[in-house]
Amino acid sequence: MAVTACQGLGFVVSLIGIAGIIAATCMDQWSTQDLYNNPVTAVFNYQGLWRSCVRESSGFTECRGYFTLLGLPAMLQAVRALMIVGIVLGAIGLLVSIFALKCIRIGSMEDSAKANMTLTSGIMFIVSGLCAIAGVSVFANMLVTNFWMSTANMYTGMGGMVQTVQTRYTFGAALFVGWVAGGLTLIGGVMMCIACRGLAPEETNYKAVSYHASGHSVAYKPGGFKASTGFGSNTKNKKIYDGGARTEDEVQSYPSKHDYV
C-alpha cells in the first residue's frame, strides 16, 4: 500500500513539476528591466527565451520574437536546449510512468516489469528536473554577470549621440517557476526510484529436497525454479541438476525407506 502511495505521489509531483517546466519555458518574464526617467511614458521591458516585450504605463504591451539565431548569446541557446531536453525527458518519463503505476493493470504485466519502468521513469524525472534547474541557473548567472547594471556610457556617432539607458535587470517570475518546477520534478523522480525498490519482488530460493532414484547419482532439485525478478542469475528458470546428492543447504541426504523412485 505504501509503495503504491509513494509511486502515485511521485507521479503527481513529477506531473506538476513538468507542467511547471513547460510553463517556465514559455513564459516571457525570464528577465525584467525597468527603463527609468522617460518623460513620455514609463516603459517596462521583460524578456523570455523566445521573445522580448515592452509594456507601457498605459497598459499597452508589444512583444517581438527573436527571429534570428545569430544575434542571440550562446548561453541563451544553451538554456533553450536544456529546457527543451528537460521537457522531452519529462514527457517520456510521464508516459512510461503511467504504464508503470501499480494501480493500473495492463494485460499480464509482471511486477518486475513495472519495477523496471518505475525506475526508468524515476531516472528520467531526475534528469529532467536537473536540466530545468541547470537551465534556470545558467540564465540567472548570465543576468548577474552580464546584464545586472548597464553603465550609462555616452559616445557620438554619425547619427548624433547615443546614451546607453541606465537599466537594472532583475530575475523574472519564470526563473522562480523554473527552479520550483525543476525541484518538484526531481523530488518526484526520487520518489519513483524509492517506489521501484518496493515494487521489485524479493528473490526467493525455496528449500530444495533431493529425490534419489535408486541406482542413479543424479538428484533433481525443484528449488531450481526461482521466483525471478529479472535481476537474478537464473533468469531463464532453467532446471538445475546436480551430480551430488545434496540440498541447497549442503546437507547430505541419505536414502531411506521413505525415498520414492
Epitope: 522617460n38 511614458t41 547619427g159 547615443v162 539607458v165
Partner: nanobody, 121 residues
Framework: EVQLVESGGGLVQAGGSLRLSCVAS????????MSWYRRAPGKQRELVAG???????NYADSVKGRFTISRDNAKNTVYLQMNSLKPDDTAVYYC???????????????WGQGTQVTVSS
C-alpha cells in the same frame, strides 16, 4: 549602426506651419518611444512632444493644441506637425528615440543631429 536623420526644418513666418520628420535606420529590433526635443539659444534642452508604440503622447505645455506628434511604426519614422508657429518656437529640434538594436540586449537613448527651425516675426 543606428542613425536618426531629421528633416523638414527651415525659415517660416509667425503663424505659419512646418512638418518635421525623423527616420531611424540601421539595425533596429524595437523602438518603444520616439520624441522631439528642442534647444533654443541660451536655454536648456526641453521635451516638445513624445509618442510611444502604443500611441501614448506627451506634449510640453507651451505647444499643446498647436503641435501634433505622430509616428509610422512600419517605417520607424516620427513626425511633428507644427502649426501657429511663434518666434518663441525658434530652436534646433532634435529627434530622440529609445531603441533596442539587438533582440537580446539593452536599450539605447539615440539622438539625431538636429534641424534648425526659425520663426520670423
Amino acid at each position: 549602426e543606428v542613425q536618426l536623420v531629421e528633416s523638414g526644418g527651415g525659415l517660416v513666418q509667425a503663424g505659419g506651419s512646418l512638418r518635421l520628420s525623423c527616420v531611424a535606420s540601421g539595425s533596429i529590433f524595437h523602438i518603444p518611444i520616439m520624441s522631439w526635443y528642442r534647444r533654443a539659444p541660451g536655454k536648456q534642452r526641453e521635451l516638445v512632444a513624445g509618442i510611444s508604440t502604443g500611441g501614448s503622447t506627451n506634449y510640453a505645455d507651451s505647444v499643446k493644441g498647436r503641435f501634433t506628434i505622430s509616428r509610422d511604426n512600419a517605417k520607424n519614422t516620427v513626425y511633428l506637425q507644427m502649426n501657429s508657429l511663434k518666434p518663441d518656437d525658434t530652436a534646433v529640434y532634435y529627434c530622440n528615440s529609445l531603441i533596442k538594436e539587438e533582440a537580446w540586449g539593452t536599450f539605447g537613448d539615440y539622438w539625431g543631429q538636429g534641424t534648425q527651425v526659425t520663426v520670423s516675426s
